[in-house]
Interface confidence: low
Amino acid sequence: QGWQAFKNDATEIIPELGEYPEPPPELENNKTMNRAENGGRPPHHPFETKDVSEYSCRELHFTRYVTDGPCRSAKPVTELVCSGQCGPARLLPNAIGRGKWWRPSGPDFRCIPDRYRAQRVQLLCPGGEAPRARKVRLVASCKCKRLTRFHNQSELKDFGTEAARPQKGRKPRPRARSAKANQAELENAY
């Protein structure tokens, strides 16, 4: 009762239901590529103010499989992860222990998702589970946004990924994983 294995023109092998395709090999060793250099901190001295053009809100492309419990998408989706520093930022020394701890002062600008796109994915499930389709909300672009105290903090929660969520007023999907779990998977996978 599984999906039939097939081969298309791109010589992609889709396995029988219950087996999962491995992540594409080029994604295995791109950890450094997908991270802000130097742990995201610019290599400069405290008290130095850099021009805003030297900081950018970067859009890093990640490819991942969407999961819903034991089910996994037939094909991976590509989405953006917002990364980088939004300037200008004045870096101040940390008073505690007089260590050099950098933090931005002034208005709080964050590199956060700006636009989202919906994409349909088909999920293949092992063990006789019926295949499923889901709409997932993926980050389409990033933007430096000035945060106010009224700013919805939930916007900051899921920098990396927007997991498929139940519609408003709907029961939680029995096997839907939390955004946090998907985020953890994303971070661990790459």
Epitope: W3, Q122, A130, P174
Partner: antibody, heavy 118, light 107 residues
């Protein structure tokens, strides 16, 4: 708007095969599962199998496995259901139905009557 | 296979009546249950999906509830166009299976 248009009625001899088509329009054909369901006269609905046209993945009801083949032609947005080794109890109306994301069949073809008679 | 049992198999009711149809699954299907309406000579029409979500264009007099193994379709005030056969369908496990149907007739 979404439409599923099926081929016309068929009369077949026992032991032969029938191939029913279902032409989809009004949506992206490769984005949705396309199911086949049949209904014998005066009986209930019986699921036969499904295809996901994006990669031609199929899954069938065990009852029909080996006798049913579901295919899809992406270039014409048409799905096909072929049933072989026909017997009189295969006389039924055969429906194609698009499947939405919670497993619901939200759009159905008008049905194709297949009569198996010697 | 998961067996879906509908009851009653038929019922007679009058316009304005409140009608309840039940559907029982032979094993737990969480909320993966849909309801369809079918009129003679026509294809089924989706009414309710995922146990309780109303399909677009379906009147609000239709509602669904339940979880696990027991589910209910309720028509709060039966209208002339509601006389038809109703089917439940599970989408938890393969193969997808339908209930035997409940025919709602005019009293």
């Amino acid at each position: 708007q979404v439409q599923l248009v099926q081929s016309g009625a068929e009369v077949k001899k026992p032991g032969s095969s029938v191939k029913v088509s279902c032409k989809a329009s009004g949506y992206t054909f490769t984005d949705y599962f396309l199911n086949w369901v049949r209904q014998a006269p005066g009986q209930g609905l019986e699921w036969m199998g499904t295809i996901y046209p994006y990669h031609d993945g199929t899954t069938y009801s065990q009852k029909f496995k080996g006798r049913v083949t579901i295919t899809a032609d992406k270039s014409t947005s048409t799905a096909y259901m072929e049933l072989s080794s026909l017997r009189s109890e295969d006389t039924a109306v055969y429906y194609c139905a698009r499947e939405e994301e919670d497993g619901q069949f939200d759009y159905w073809g008008q049905g194709t009557t297949v009569t198996v008679s010697s | 296979d998961i067996q879906m049992t509908q009851s009653p198999s038929s019922l007679s009711a009058s316009v304005g009546d409140r009608v309840t149809i039940t559907c029982s699954a032979s094993q737990g299907i969480q909320w993966y249950l849909n309801w369809y309406q079918q009129k003679p000579g026509k294809a089924p029409k989706l009414l309710i999906y995922y146990t309780s979500s109303l399909h677009s264009g379906v009147p609000s007099r239709f509602s669904g509830s339940g979880s696990g193994t027991d589910f209910t379709l309720t028509i709060s005030s039966l209208q002339p166009e509601d006389f038809a056969t109703y089917y439940c369908q599970q989408h938890s496990k393969l193969p997808r299976t339908f209930g035997g149907g409940t025919k709602v007739e005019i009293k």
